[in-house]
Amino acid sequence: MKVLQEPTCVSDYMSISTCEWKMNGPTNCSTELRLLYQLVFLLSEAHTCIPENNGGAGCVCHLLMDDVVSADNYTLDLWAGQQLLWKGSFKPSEHVKPRAPGNLTVHTNVSDTLLLTWSNPYPPDNYLYNHLTYAVNIWSENDPADFRIYNVTYLEPSLRIAASTLKSGISYRARVRAWAQCYNTTWSEWSPSTKWHNSYREPFEQH
């Protein structure tokens, strides 16, 4: 049993880091493998993560952490029984993938303006709370070419667009994701999408 692709890990900068790797063949990750992780400080405990399958030869493990301090560093040991398959380290603050925003809502009752709101995935006391910016993806269910991205570079988790920038009388979906420039994070996963029927009053044409 060998590791084909070494573990790569990302942190949500709160309490969970996720590590993924690939084995050289089909593996029952939860019964055959264990990922041990330990904060590199005196008195820290070694913790054991039981991986889950992520495709035939892929494994994923969710590492629980009490907090993320900027200088934290963890040792990682991947074991198959008594055999050490891989040894590495991981600094959560250098590999951040924010949590996905939630509660995406489209408000259609604001005089031909669409107001999209969502929730910041972090509590106010988390460092990322005031550092997230967002991308909103809106697409038509009827027309695959009608696909657009709005970059929200301000902190408020909302976006206003004129309903008339979209086609009237058809259904649209929207989703949102986040990133934080300060930590050069990757993008979060997309939020669950929400659907609405776009309709607005066409302005009267004057001849």
Partner: antibody, heavy 120, light 107 residues
Amino acid sequence: QVTLKESGPTLVKPTQTLTLTCTFSGFSLSTSGMGVGWIRQPPGKALEWLALIWWADDKRYSTSLKSRLTISKDTSKNQVVLTITNVDPVDTATYYCARITRGNSAMDFWGQGTSVTVSS
Amino acid sequence: DIQMTQSPSSLSASVGDRVTITCRASENVYSYLNWYQQKPGKAPKLLIYNAKSLQSGVPSRFSGSGSGTDFTLTISSLQPEDFATYYCQHHYGIPWTFGGGTKLEIK
């Protein structure tokens, strides 16, 4: 050996700002893994965690008091300062500082505490 | 915020008794839990960290167990110096919070 000592005013008027200083020896906040936290205890009541600062200058605050608290460190003087703005009689308490080690996030050494009364 | 609930709030026992104090978290805190002892007019003292690890210099009659939401501090044979108030405290995420305390008194 590790020692910590809190200092600050014993009496503060409502709406004023309370400044508390923790002076410590036996460890350094320039050492990786070290932190100092503040905890308070109103008379006859339970302990309440307020704030902490780590060697890397990461700061953490109580949710309910965050808007009123500021924690800072002076590594060269071996001091940590906590300020509480707009104090109220409910802030009357014994205030403790404690050393924290990142390895187990436990408060393993405590100061003797300093008693603060908020009253006009 | 995670709430920590200790029971009982007070307890009477005799020297030599085996005593158990429980602490319940309002949500999973895994093993990120510490126990402290406080005597009147004194600062708290760390007894147990990470739910079950005994702090250096603390007598072996003290032990901790549990994980998730339910934790226990046990004193196997009470000594006169153990009569005090005991607090649990979690450190899973911010803010850290303490339990309301358990006052252990002489019967």
